[in-house]
């Protein structure tokens, strides 16, 4: 955690556990209004190393949808069309945050969970073993 | 927000705002235990995009340590090493949640906030605008 | 049901060419990816060609220049042509699903159209 | 090409048996994603192959449980617990990790 003195103007916590246990307000602010709002839209198309996008749905997380990316292929897709297995598509991970119900059910309380998402793919060269 | 039904184990909430102020338990949990250990780590160099990454810190956010990935080419990598600028390296963007500190310096309580992050690149191929 | 079912003509003629159809019935071309396999008699089996999903398309490099492969979605049917045929490419021909959770194996087979290759 | 070797090529077995086949691949089947795209298929007299086994030891839904794939890397194996006369035939290794797909020359479970 990071020692930050109490402000005096702060919302009291009388939790025998703080600073684990904290208030959230889920008004969220977005910060992205300034940027371009095509973003990665089309990238998982135009692509060498194209991906579908699959729906993860949770009631029990927040947010609940979650877009989970799925490399089309092996291998990259050359300018002829042609997928190339000499070079390989693979997804790009990122570990996000999210907050889980808990107890389940619960409407107002909710733990930080940590999970590993597949954003998009990118094409590598791969690692060659060969056996002797 | 999710209409799920009040379980009576659940802590009570006397917050007049309820349901946009909410406790969370900043104990994380993970749910990468089982994933592949090699994730994304070297593909930012081996990638026909490769990237860089930057480290963002700001001690009023949590996680406070965000780490940005700029496209090191506006072309991508060929297999003789050169750049071909047939191609683009675009950044593979996701919005991510954070907590931001509010009021700020405020130890135990945030406010839910949407942020963009440049997750990796992927070359994909230009669109080409002609001129009549 | 997942169903393939590949339609050619039986008997070529060496140096002509070779047109077989696999029309498909309980999934869609524009999901799965479709494979041409071969199996000359009492022999084992050689992949030839996939095309994928999204039209794309994987060649075995060593028949990459005698063979074609395209789809019409709207008709589930994917064509497979091969040019110059020789003797030795009397087989068993196959179209072959693409395996489903990005499997990459193949998980539905057609029951296969036999080829000959004789004068 | 990636080379398939299967040991052995012909297996006589009495029912009731286990059945282990060999599958060694001439380079490693791990793709950069850390999967490994190394299946087994089945060839009964006259029909198709069918799927038993995808990415290493996965089983292929209706596949029994007494079949079942181990290995890693460049070595692999298809064990049957308890061979049933429904299981005879030809065993085919194959990898999807490099193109062009290849597999094994087959190994023919067959009664003693």
């Known amino acids: 955690g990071i020692a930050i003195p109490r402000n005096s103007g702060c919302p009291n916590s009388e939790d025998k556990n703080f600073p684990r246990t904290v208030m959230v307000n889920l008004n969220i602010h977005n910060r992205n209004t300034s940027t371009n709002p095509k973003r990665s839209s089309d990238y998982y198309n135009r692509s060498t190393s194209p991906w579908n996008l699959h729906r993860n749905e949770d009631p029990e997380r927040y947010p609940s949808v979650i877009w989970e990316a799925k490399c089309r292929h092996l291998g990259c897709v050359k300018a002829d069309g042609n997928v190339d297995y000499h070079m390989n598509s693979v997804p790009i991970q990122q570990e996000i945050l999210v907050l889980r119900r808990e107890p389940r059910h619960c409407p107002n309380s909710f733990r930080l969970e940590k999970i590993l998402v597949s954003v998009g793919c990118t094409c590598v060269t791969p690692i060659v073993h060969h056996v002797a | 927000g999710i209409a799920i039904p009040r379980n009576s184990g659940c802590p009570n909430s006397e917050d007049k705002n309820f349901p946009r102020t909410v406790m969370v338990n900043l104990n994380i949990h993970n749910r990468n235990t089982s994933t592949n250990p090699k994730r994304s780590s070297d593909y930012y160099n081996r990638s026909t995009s490769p990237w860089n990454l930057h480290r963002n810190e700001d001690p009023e956010r949590y996680p406070s340590v965000i780490w940005e990935a700029k496209c090191r080419h506006l072309g991508c990598v060929k297999a003789d090493g050169n750049v071909d600028y047939h191609m683009n390296s675009v950044p593979i963007q996701q919005e991510i949640l954070v907590l931001r500190r509010e009021p700020r310096h405020c130890p135990n309580s945030f406010r839910l906030e949407k942020i963009l992050v440049s997750v990796g690149c992927t070359c994909v191929t230009p669109i080409v605008h002609h001129v009549a | 049901q997942v169903e393939l079912k590949e339609s050619g003509p039986g008997l070529v003629a060496p140096s002509q060419s070779l047109s077989i159809t696999c029309t498909v019935s309980g999934f869609s071309l524009t999901s799965y990816g479709v494979y041409w396999v071969r199996q000359p008699p009492g022999k084992g089996l050689e992949w030839l060609v996939v095309?994928?999903?999204?039209?794309?398309?994987t060649y075995n490099s060593a028949l990459k220049s005698r063979l074609s492969i395209s789809k019409d979605n709207s008709k589930s049917q994917v064509f497979l042509k091969m040019n110059s045929l020789q003797t030795d490419d009397t087989a068993m021909y196959y179209c072959a699903r693409q395996g489903d959770n990005y499997s990459y194996a193949v998980d539905y087979w057609g029951q296969g159209t036999a080829v000959t290759v004789s004068s | 090409d990636v080379v398939m070797i299967q040991i052995p090529l012909s297996l006589p077995v009495s029912l009731g048996d286990q059945a282990s086949i060999s599958c060694r691949s001439s380079?490693?089947?791990?793709?950069?994603?850390?999967?490994?795209?190394l299946h087994w298929y089945l060839q009964k007299p006259g029909q198709s192959p069918k799927l038993l086994i995808y990415?290493?030891?996965n089983r292929f839904s209706g596949v029994p449980d007494r079949f079942s794939g181990s290995g890693s890397g460049t070595d692999f194996t298809l064990k049957i617990s308890r061979v049933e006369a429904e299981d005879l035939g030809v065993y085919f290794c194959s990898q999807s990790t490099h193109a062009p797909l290849t597999f094994g020359a087959g190994t023919k479970l067959e009664l003693k």
């Open positions: 095309i994928w999903s999204d039209g794309t398309t």
């Open positions: 990415k290493v030891f």
């Open positions: 380079q490693s089947l791990v793709h950069s994603n850390g999967n490994t795209y």
